[in-house]
């Protein structure tokens, strides 16, 4: 479907064409349930709440409504060269028995997440492959998406910025231009313990050292790769427990938010690191607000009830520009008996080094 937001003069400032699939985990009296449904063809733009952004005060937003009070919102932001969907939020009404049969709660829920939907100014964002955005108990997948904000003439621009998934991955990446002052390689990060608890007790136990590997363009147009350690002494942890999604959210030094999302394969009873999202500030970058996300990972896997352990350094590639180096990881998600790690499943790297 095509969605459009117009300004007072009738000129479109946001145009978006995509199909969307929702996967929502919710509780019923007989236990957790997962519902999947598509954005219906009669979904409409909420004109009163969508906006081209008021001068100097707010950014453009597209609010799409469907069903009995459900809304999907895309909030945009921009700088001199790029724009992005800074935040996607989904409000869903569990009293809609058509979409959420037998829901034990009838409340209205709100979930939101940063996204990696971004494009050059004056070009449209194009993504034929599915773009997944994970938000607590909800996953939204956009298919065949063409999105553009900050328009002035009610039509998509000729040029486009393709999403990461659509781009062919080169067999050998071109070398990055030399950086005038390469960052010194930091020492291994400190290992810290993290736990997330919900109404049913602990759903995540983790011990690990975290290092961010970031590649970005600086203001002088040189490309630099930096390694940043997450300092446990300057990091606060929070999270949430769900039947199908466990999240660990780390806020570090006031400028970095790192989100880990663990999923579960019900048929094989295995948990795994499914998604990583990063939101940080790089003062020397051409675009200081660095954001990256990937919700299709399959890392740190173990059987539910057991723990995953790896003494070797693990590299989890999130995007072309961002990976996480995880040191001495020991993690267990969903089922944590007595707040203690269960039987250990060693990583292949450790087994091979024995």
């Amino acid at each position: 479907a095509m969605f459009m937001v117009k300004n007072g003069q009738g000129t479109a400032c946001i145009m978006a064409q995509f199909s969307a699939a929702f996967s929502v985990n919710y509780d019923t009296k007989s236990g957790p349930k997962q519902m999947t449904f598509d954005l219906p063809s009669d979904a409409t733009v909420v004109l009163q709440r969508s906006s081209c952004g008021k001068e100097q005060t707010s950014d453009p937003s597209l609010v799409i409504a469907f069903g009995r009070g459900h809304t999907l919102t895309l909030n945009f932001t921009r700088n001199a060269t790029r724009y992005s969907v800074q935040l996607m939020s989904f409000v869903y009404n569990l009293s809609d028995t058509h979409l959420f049969p037998n829901a034990s709660s009838k409340e209205i829920k709100t979930v939101e997440s940063i996204t990696d939907i971004r494009a050059d100014i004056d070009k449209k964002y194009r993504c034929v492959s599915g773009t997944q955005v994970h938000m607590n108990n909800v996953t939204v997948t956009l298919h065949d998406a063409t999105i553009q904000a900050y328009l002035s003439n009610s039509s998509f621009s000729r040029g486009e910025t393709r999403c990461e998934q659509d781009r062919p991955s080169p067999t050998t990446a071109p070398p990055a231009p030399p950086s005038p002052s390469p960052s010194p390689v930091p020492k291994s990060p400190s290992v810290d313990k993290y736990n997330v608890s919900g109404t049913n007790g602990t759903c995540l136990l983790a011990s690990m050292g975290l290092q961010l590997n970031l590649t970005y363009e600086r203001k002088d147009n040189t490309t630099v790769t930096r390694l940043l350690n997450i300092n446990p002494n300057k990091t606060s942890a929070s999270g949430s427990c769900g039947a199908h999604l466990v999240t660990l959210e780390l806020h570090s030094e006031g400028t970095t938010v790192l989100l880990f999302q663990f999923g579960m394969n019900a048929s094989s009873s295995r948990f795994f690191l499914q998604g990583i999202q990063l939101n940080t500030i790089l003062p020397d970058a051409r675009d200081p607000a660095f954001k990256a996300a990937n919700g299709s990972l399959r890392a740190l896997q173990a059987t539910v009830g057991n723990s995953y352990k790896c003494n070797a350094e693990e590299h989890v590639r999130v995007t072309k520009a961002f990976s996480v180096n995880i040191f001495k990881v020991w993690v267990q998600a969903f089922k944590v008996e007595g707040g203690q790690f269960g039987s250990v499943e060693e990583c292949l790297l450790d087994e091979n080094s024995m």
């Epitope: 001068e55 700088n79 001199a80 050059d120 004056d122 070009k123 002035s152 000729r158 040029g159």
Partner: antibody, heavy 118, light 106 residues
Framework: QVQLQQSGAELVKPGASVKMSCKAS????????IHWVKKSPGQGLEWIGA????????PYSQKFKDKATLTADKSSSTTYMQLSRLTSEDSAVYYC???????????WGQGTLVSVSA | DIQMTQSPPSLSASLGGKVTITCKAS??????MAWYQDKPGKGPRLLIH???TLQPGIPSRFSGSGSGRDYSFSISNLEPEDIATYYC????????FGGGTKLEIK
């Protein structure tokens, strides 16, 4: 209609700095980048940098990153460019320019002549 | 930064004749190419954007073409007022001007 009004000519000494202005009118100031372009007999037209007044983000050409500083004042719809450590090479006409979305540089100020001389 | 190599630096042609200027980008610029006319004492004037789209009010004697890294600009049926310096500009990735071509009439 879109108008870009630049400040007057400047005669400055080598080593000094100069700050010129570009006042925009006829459109929503925070919706468009303002670019600065140098025109000199020896080098022709050169793109210096741009600023997005909405948040002050300013990418620069590699050549001018240590020479020029771009700022914007939303309350007066004015963009400024400061040039530092001036030499005779910096003697030129400097234009502020607004792009018309994806139609390149469509609107030009009248230019500010900077003469660097002892 | 993307580099733009414009040639020739200068050229001389007869009234009524035709001239062609070329610009080569250091990488593919996806047809985000514009051409400007610059006369002494005046500000540069946008003639063509998006490689081949004429700005309103620009005579059809001016034309542009190209793709990828290679672009060209032509003026046919030269007139005296065409004496100027012409510049290409890429705006696919940041912004870069070519070195300019000074056009003189024989």
């Amino acid at each position: 209609q879109v108008q870009l009004q630049q400040s007057g000519a400047e005669l400055v000494k080598p080593g000094a700095s100069v700050k010129m202005s570009c006042k925009a009118s006829g459109y929503i100031f925070t919706n468009y980048n303002i670019h600065w372009v140098k025109k000199s007999p020896g080098q022709g037209l050169e793109w210096i940098g741009a600023i997005y007044p909405g948040n002050g983000d300013a990418p620069y050409s590699q050549k001018f990153k240590d020479k020029a500083t771009l700022t914007a004042d939303k309350s007066s719809s004015t963009t400024y460019m400061q040039l530092s450590r001036l030499t005779s090479e910096d003697s030129a006409v400097y234009y502020c320019v607004r792009a018309n979305w994806d139609v390149a540089f469509a609107y030009w100020g009248q230019g500010t002549l900077v003469s660097v001389s002892a | 930064d993307i580099q733009m190599t414009q040639s020739p630096p200068s050229l001389s042609a007869s009234l009524g004749g035709k001239v062609t200027i070329t610009c080569k980008a250091s990488q593919d610029i996806d047809r985000y190419m514009a051409w400007y006319q610059d006369k002494p004492g005046k500000g540069p004037r946008l003639l063509i954007h998006d490689t081949s789209t004429l700005q309103p009010g620009i005579p059809s004697r001016f034309s542009g073409s190209g793709s990828g890294r290679d672009y060209s600009f032509s003026i046919s049926n030269l007139e005296p007022e065409d004496i100027a310096t012409y510049y290409c500009l890429q705006y696919d990735n940041l912004w870069t001007f070519g070195g300019g071509t000074k056009l003189e009439i024989k």
